[in-house]
């Protein structure tokens, strides 16, 4: 449970009524859209001996609900209908027979905003705690995914990029990951909270955007992070090149990495010819690849693709299902809006591709 979602507990004390009746719950909780929160809650109500054999049922209702007419948003009573819009998302996680009325909310939605009250029933003992009530505030999703690039991106060398949302919660609907990149890519493994993209960069992929988009379908909210690829040709010992960018979009180079140009016109001409050949082959192969799905279980090929707006063509790879519930959170993360990994070619100029073709790889 992300700690920031559990606000400092503003406990409302025992009711000012009778020491026999009380409910303790924080009066206000804030949760970001698409995320989840567990609200601790305890209550007490005197149970007469004559109700001892009856099961204890707990209910959370929206403020203003009429018990006899309106369904609760959550209950532990199996045959009780609950509000359609909260079904499966609001759960009475606490055990009312142990005086626990804790409420779990997952895939928080804007319309969850409002106040809620708890009700307990045990045989003929039935009581609605109209005070204190729980006020739920659903705010914008400000968290964004982290993208981990281990080491340096080199042309022709495959690297595993990890997009993670370690701040998301286990209990919610697993998010849908979408990757958007011009570079040749394929999908790697995913967990509940992360997705791996296998990228094999080409020289011309330097400076292009790579976007990881994460959609929380349970709440219909999306968040993304975009980085700029730095494809570095390093013949010597490779060094990690991950730098936060300033968002200006300017290409940066690391001082002391660019070495002298390769001498000789003949060598230059030969190199230019080789580069042209390689570029043509790669481009043709890329077009073919764009017609065949790289992803697994291509079940939603018509789903709309992600930005950037300048993309000419997009390629969707169908969602991959996961039943895993363990989220691996990468330790190296990229925090800025736009990132650059330093791109330096030893003795060559990367050709500019004016009609970059972006490929979107979507996982679920």
């Amino acid at each position: 449970m992300p700690l920031l979602l559990l606000l400092p507990l503003l406990w409302a004390g025992a009711l000012a009524m009778d020491p026999n009746f009380w409910l303790q719950v924080q009066e206000s909780v804030t949760v970001q859209e698409g995320l989840c929160v567990l609200v601790p809650c305890t209550f007490f109500h005197p149970i007469p001996y004559y109700d001892k054999n009856s099961p204890v049922h707990g209910y959370w209702f929206r403020e203003g609900a009429i018990i006899s007419r309106d369904s609760p948003v959550a209950t532990n009573k199996l045959d009780q209908e609950v509000q359609e819009e909260t079904q499966g998302r609001f759960r009475l996680l606490g055990d009312p027979s142990r005086n626990n009325c804790s409420l779990s909310i997952v895939d928080a939605r804007r319309r969850d905003n409002g106040s809620y009250f708890f009700r307990m029933e045990r045989g003929s003992t039935k009581y609605s705690y109209k005070s204190p009530q729980l006020s739920v505030h659903v705010t914008d999703l400000t968290h964004r995914p982290k993208i981990l690039i281990p080491g340096t991106l080199e042309p022709g060398h495959s690297k595993n990029l990890t997009c993670s949302v370690s701040w998301a919660c286990e209990q919610g609907t697993p998010p849908i990951f979408s990757w958007l990149s011009a570079a040749p890519t394929s999908l790697g493994p995913r967990t509940t909270h992360s997705s791996v993209l296998i990228i094999t960069p080409r020289p011309q992929d330097h400076g292009t955007n790579l976007t990881c988009q994460v959609k929380f379908a349970g709440a219909g909210v999306t968040t993304e992070r975009t980085i700029q690829l730095n494809v570095t040709y390093v013949p010597q010992n490779p060094t990690t090149g991950i730098f936060p960018g300033d968002g200006s979009g300017k290409q940066e180079t690391r001082a002391g990495v660019v070495h002298g140009a390769i001498g000789g016109a003949g060598v230059t001409a030969l190199l230019a010819l080789c580069l042209c050949l390689i570029f043509f082959i790669v481009k043709t192969h890329r077009r073919k690849a764009a017609r065949t799905a790289v992803g697994r279980n291509d079940t939603h090929p018509t789903t709309g693709s992600a930005s950037p707006k300048h993309q000419k063509k997009s390629k969707l790879h169908g969602p991959t299902e996961t039943s895993s519930c363990s989220g691996a959170a990468p330790t190296v993360e990229m925090d800025e809006e736009l990132h650059y990994a330093s791109l330096n070619f030893h003795g060559m100029n990367p050709s500019k591709d004016t009609s970059t073709e972006y490929s979107e790889v979507r996982t679920q």
Epitope: M17, D18, N20, F21, F44, P46, I47, P48, Y49, Y50, D51, K52, N53, I67, S68, N99, R119, E121, G123, S124, T125, K126, Y127, S128, K130
Partner: antibody, heavy 127, light 107 residues
Framework: QVQLVQSGAEVKKPGASVRVSCKAS????????VHWVRQAPGQGLEWMGI????????TYAQRLQGRVTMTRDLSTSTVYMELSSLTSEDTAVYFC????????????????????WGQGTLVTVSS | DIRMTQSPPSLSASVGDRVTIPCQAS??????LNWYQQKPGKAPQLLIY???NLEIGVPSRFSGSGSGTDFTLTISSLQPEDIATYYC?????????FGGGTKVEIK
Amino acid sequence: QVQLVQSGAEVKKPGASVRVSCKASGYIFTNYYVHWVRQAPGQGLEWMGIISPSGGSPTYAQRLQGRVTMTRDLSTSTVYMELSSLTSEDTAVYFCARESRLRGNRLGLQSSIFDHWGQGTLVTVSS
Amino acid sequence: DIRMTQSPPSLSASVGDRVTIPCQASQDINNHLNWYQQKPGKAPQLLIYDTSNLEIGVPSRFSGSGSGTDFTLTISSLQPEDIATYYCQQYENLPLTFGGGTKVEIK
């Protein structure tokens, strides 16, 4: 001081309905359950049912199920008992009683007592 | 339903006498028993709760005892103001049930 004041005597014809009120004062209305008990002339006490102060479906004695309805009005701290399809067997004094629950055992179960009663309402069913 | 039986339905005693009023439950009620006193034309009043606990304001000549299914209300020294009908009531289970009552009169 705690008081339960009931409505006045009623005379009804068989098949009719009667509604008896019980107005509470001197305590926090929403903290106590209210029961209804009746007593036919020269007979013992018969429990009719219980209503929660915060609403929801009351619990009724099985033999009265379908004929008795208990409601409450928070704004006036009043509990009502309505009995329909009256017969001569329903001629009785009807009492409302406040239930107090005393500190209980380690399981949280509590003793139950009727610590305050209304003065009673005589309902006579006669053709 | 738990049946509560009070026998005899009435008894006569002299002022100052020790009076015992029995009550029997049809099953074990775990001491979950109250005693009420009802005077003619009045509502019942709580005397004893939980088998043996004296309600506040009730004279100490009243006491209760028993366990399981057999219970007794005792008036150690009968007074004229004790003329009333006495009811036992169980709260072990719903429906709550009362005994038929025992009417106490002065000889």
